[in-house]
């Protein structure tokens, strides 16, 4: 059980107040984290509170400003990047968001040696992506879907690609579906470790169907936004990977890296690229039916001036019980011999663990094991491997950092974080300097987040980087809800849940219950993290009990739970929420006439299906930007879990799992449907179809659209959204305003 900072003295009670909706919307209780921008083994950059860029040397204890806030302000810079030779800094301004990760910006190059901006051969604008080489100060950038190279910032650019075309051919940047569902980055180019080669992806979207929606703006006529967006079963982008020698780019030009034969024989995806050395690269490919992944290690043949990918260096990862990997196929972390690597994949018991691959995947050596999962490999050095897992005390919603000594035999394992601040910190991530000389630990909770700096050899804490003192002080007079994380055992399934309870919670009383659900494949909602958000307010001020439940399909508890939803989305996720609600009612403090459910995106889909389950459990519910039919969602995501919407594959379940098919069942619940009209991700089409089905079934419901808002419903829409949902819930639960 995790109790938030306790309020022990009753005399304090009257000076304390509940959270307000305003607190949440103003971000009054938001926290800060500190991620060092590492530039060597012992140095990092950080942007100070007054916007100076400061270089810190851990070993000397010295710090100095490398770039003043005055210089930053002169071009309205919101971001920066130091060249590895420390001669130049790029300054980023005019940030203009595109999709989840992508944005365009204007870039200025500042010469640190003379304290002036580089004049002559300035960069064009707006640029889609820009980065320094890992060594020196070469620049690669993407402008109008083509890649350019500069040997030095003041040099004229060398154009690498010429076929880039808006919405047709993307070079060095992903198209919509690769950005959102495969790479999870704004870039699709990768420098080799010493900057000799530049690898990049080319995405051909020529044959992809286009999603078109109106953007209303302020003009007399709305604009139409067109995005090549492959929905389930549609034509997909065609991807090719090229590598160019950046020292002599005109000599042989870009060389294509071959796709493995077993992948090339049908539709496929490129999933990631990892440089091993300057002359060895590792590419990962995935069949369109995403249960087979191939990792291919390719070598530069000097005599051929091309990249050779021998069959002996192809490693196949196949899932027989679900899809390959977790949310994504894991990426390899290479060891110092530049051929063997560490990788997370399922062991024979169906738990994701670290394996060491020296020759073949069949002969992989398992490094971690147990009924828990290894989650991320942070760093491999000559003698240590650092990773995170949820092993400690068998709580799947925790993250601790471990070190395995790989230099000694047998390897020994040490938990670096388990006992550091045990009550406050149970969910960590880490950021390592070169050679893991030092590292930062960022603790996300359950207590107030804290970031600390550590010695990579001894794990000794060197200093606190950020402890959120102001937040701690601000919360001193706030009645925060209590939180507990527990589990239910139902029919051989473990359902972990987080319950958020009103500050003066009394088990003998009855409380309205709100279920917050996401429930998407490989997600996790029950996590030991700190948050003061809308549901905190609902518990603190409005006296609701809020519960989050991780059912079948969720992550980090083994493949049996994860792959249970394979090819049948919308069934078990809903069943498990319903099962949990029934168990909560049995606990005796839930008013069974006042139960609601809400969710966003995948959670909107699950909440809609739960409301339409016909159980009579829910009085009301909210779906924000829900998927309503898997035929409307992106191919890469949907087909990973559902297969294809064809007769000979899984069309039947595609049809059976829609929200529209259950329109009649909404008759006995209060339903609030919400969507942004400019949602590039889960298209407004989804809610339009739900609304149409409800109207056709003559079922009353409430709805709210947000004009020109995307999947995030940001800005003023956020305030309106949460205010609107609060009114809806209070009305549903008969709570006075």
């Amino acid at each position: 059980i995790v109790l938030r900072p306790s309020r022990v003295h009753n005399s304090e009670e009257n000076t304390m107040r509940a959270l307000t909706l305003k607190d949440i919307l103003n971000g009054t209780f938001s926290y800060k984290t500190f991620f060092p921008n590492w530039i060597s083994g012992q140095e990092y950059l950080h942007q100070s509170a007054d916007n100076n860029i400061v270089l810190y040397n851990i070993e000397t204890g010295q710090s100095y400003t490398i770039l003043s806030n005055r210089t930053m302000k002169s071009v309205n810079a919101s971001n920066y990047g130091l060249s590895p030779d420390r001669q130049f800094v790029y300054l980023e301004s005019d940030y203009s968001k595109l999709w989840r990760y992508s944005y365009t910006a204007t870039y200025y190059i500042y010469d640190l040696s003379n304290g002036e901006f580089v004049r002559g051969n300035e960069l064009p604008r707006p640029i889609q992506y820009l980065c320094w080489s890992p060594v020196g100060s070469k620049l690669a950038y993407v402008y109008q879907n083509n890649i350019y190279l500069k040997q030095r910032p003041g040099d004229p650019p060398f154009q690498i690609t010429f076929n880039g075309r808006e919405n047709k051919i993307f070079n060095g940047i992903p198209d919509w579906v690769y950005e959102e569902e495969m790479l999870a980055t704004k870039y699709a180019l990768w420098w080799s470790p010493n900057g000799k080669f530049l690898a990049y992806a080319e995405f051909n979207d020529t044959d992809i169907p286009v999603i078109a929606y109106s953007y209303y703006g302020d003009e007399q006529y709305p604009r139409t936004i067109n995005i090549p967006y492959p929905k389930a079963g549609a034509k997909n982008p065609v991807v090719r990977i090229f590598i160019i020698d950046t020292t002599y780019p005109a000599y042989v030009g870009p060389q294509e890296v071959p796709v493995p034969a077993m992948i090339a024989s049908s539709d496929y995806y490129f999933s990631w690229l990892t440089w091993v050395t300057d002359e060895r690269v590792c590419l990962q490919w995935l069949k369109r039916v995403q249960n087979v992944s191939v990792l291919s290690i390719c070598d530069f043949r000097e005599d051929w001036q091309t990249w050779d990918c021998p069959k002996t260096q192809e490693h196949i990862e196949e899932s027989r019980t679900g899809w390959a990997g977790g949310f994504f196929v894991s990426t390899p972390v290479f060891s110092y011999d530049a051929i063997s690597y560490y990788k997370i994949f399922s062991d024979k018991d169906g738990y994701k663990h670290i394996h060491y691959i020296k020759d073949t995947v069949e002969n992989a050596i398992q490094i971690t094991s147990g009924k828990w999962e290894a989650i991320n490999i942070f760093r491999v050095t000559q003698d240590s491997l650092f990773y995170s897992s949820n092993e400690f005390e068998e709580y799947p919603g925790r993250r601790n950092i471990y070190r395995i000594s790989i230099g000694s035999y047998p390897p020994s394992k040490k938990c670096v974080t388990c006992h550091l601040r045990k009550e406050r910190c149970q969910y960590y991530t880490a950021s390592f300097s070169d050679y893991a000389k030092y590292y930062a630990l960022v603790c996300y909770g359950p207590g107030i987040p804290i970031s600390t700096l550590h010695d990579g050899r001894t794990d000794q804490e060197i200093k606190i980087l950020e402890e959120n003192k102001e937040l701690e002080n601000a919360l001193k007079n706030i009645q925060l809800p209590k939180e507990e994380i527990k589990k239910l055992e139902v029919d051989e399934i473990t359902l972990w849940y987080k319950m958020i309870l009103p500050p003066q919670f009394d088990r003998s009383k009855k409380y309205p219950l709100l279920i917050q659900v996401y429930g998407g494949p490989c997600s996790q909602s029950v996590r030991s993290v700190f948050a003061v958000n809308w549901i905190s307010y609902l518990a603190s001020k409005e006296g609701m009990v809020i519960a989050l439940v991780d059912g079948r399909g969720t992550a980090f508890q083994g493949d049996k739970l994860l792959y249970a939803v394979y090819r049948k989305l919308g069934v078990y996720e809903v069943e498990d929420q319903i099962t949990a609600v029934r168990k909560f009612i049995e606990m005796g403090f839930i008013d069974e006439k006042r139960i609601a459910i809400w969710g966003w995106s995948y959670g909107g889909y699950v909440s809609s299906l739960a409301l339409a389950s016909g159980t009579g459990l829910f009085k009301c519910g909210i779906a924000v930007a829900p998927v309503s039919s898997w035929e409307y969602y992106a191919s890469v995501y949907t087909e990973r879990f559902m297969g294809l919407p064809t007769k000979d594959d899984n069309l039947e379940h595609y049809k059976n799992s829609t929200v529209m098919a259950r329109a009649e069942y909404f008759r006995n619940v209060d339903y609030l449907l919400i969507h942004g009209t400019a949602d590039d991700n889960v298209h407004f089409q989804n809610s339009a179809q739900i609304a149409k089905a409800l109207v056709n079934a003559q079922v009353d419901f409430q709805a709210m659209w947000y004009s020109d808002q995307n999947h995030g419903l940001s800005g003023l829409s956020t305030n309106h959204l949460y205010t609107h949902m609060t009114h809806f819930l209070k009305q549903c639960f008969s709570l006075s305003d």
């Epitope: 077993m262 043949r301 091309t306 021998p310 069959k311 196949e318 069949e362």
Partner: antibody, heavy 119, light 109 residues
Framework: DVQLVESGGGVVRPGESLTLSCAAS????????MGWVRQAPGEGLEWVSG????????YYADSVKGRFTISRDSSKNTLYLQMNSLRAEDTAVYYC????????????WGLGTLVTVSS | EIVLTQSPGTLSLSPGERATLSCRAS??????LAWYQQKPGQAPRLLIY???NRASGISDRFSGSGSGTEFTLTISRLEPEDFAVYYC???????????FGGGTKVEIK
């Protein structure tokens, strides 16, 4: 020494079936991709089918796709070619061949077995 | 599918002479090309792989060259045992279908 010995050839009528076997020795059979290549009387070489060392992936020439099935049994160090719906144009000497472990050229060949399809 | 065209179809030469055999690909195959020798009643034997590397046990009379679409097999001084049919094979990116050229017969003049 690497040895590949084909067997199972013979005379069959059009539409009938035949299974060819190739017994392999002198190398770690399960580590290598294998293939079948045929040669019609007086003609050149034609690649027929290939199989990965793991047995997970199989490939076929368009001329035999849907009629021939390649398989392997690593416990017996044997490669097979199941040939159904045979046609007159399938008449040839069928060679079993071991691919190089890095690339798909053929390092070693068997002596071949003759398949005659005739009415 | 990649088509390989060998020329000439037949080459009539005397022992001691130099033989030059050509193989042209319908599209670039990089360096992924092998040469085989086949004598009557025998199985083919690998001579050259990766366009220019000699297989083990192959005499240095045999050499391969070329890349992309144009390849050459050269036999520097023909010995009596060299009279046979020679085939080229592409294995570009190890992708099926693997294809062979039609063959060049080297016969005694």
């Amino acid at each position: 020494d690497v040895q590949l010995v084909e067997s199972g050839g013979g005379v069959v009528r059009p539409g009938e079936s035949l299974t060819l076997s190739c017994a392999a020795s002198g190398f770690t059979f399960s580590s290598y991709d294998m293939g079948w290549v045929r040669q019609a009387p007086g003609e050149g070489l034609e690649w027929v089918s290939g199989i990965r060392g793991s047995g997970g992936s199989t490939y076929y020439a368009d001329s035999v796709k849907g009629r021939f099935t390649i398989s392997r049994d690593s416990s017996k160090n044997t490669l097979y070619l199941q040939m159904n719906s045979l046609r007159a144009e399938d008449t040839a000497v069928y060679y079993c061949a071991k691919e190089n472990n890095r690339h798909s050229f053929f390092e070693y060949w068997g002596l071949g077995t003759l398949v005659t399809v005739s009415s | 599918e990649i088509v390989l065209t060998q020329s000439p179809g037949t080459l009539s030469l005397s022992p001691g002479e130099r033989a030059t055999l050509s193989c042209r690909a319908s599209q670039s195959v990089g360096y992924y090309l092998a040469w085989y020798q086949q004598k009557p009643g025998q199985a083919p034997r690998l001579l050259i792989y990766d366009a220019s590397n000699r297989a083990s046990g192959i005499s240095d009379r045999f050499s391969g060259s070329g890349s992309g679409t144009e390849f050459t097999l050269t036999i520097s001084r023909l010995e009596p045992e060299d009279f046979a049919v020679y085939y080229c094979q592409q294995y570009y990116n190890n992708w099926p279908p693997l294809t062979f050229g039609g063959g060049t017969k080297v016969e005694i003049k």
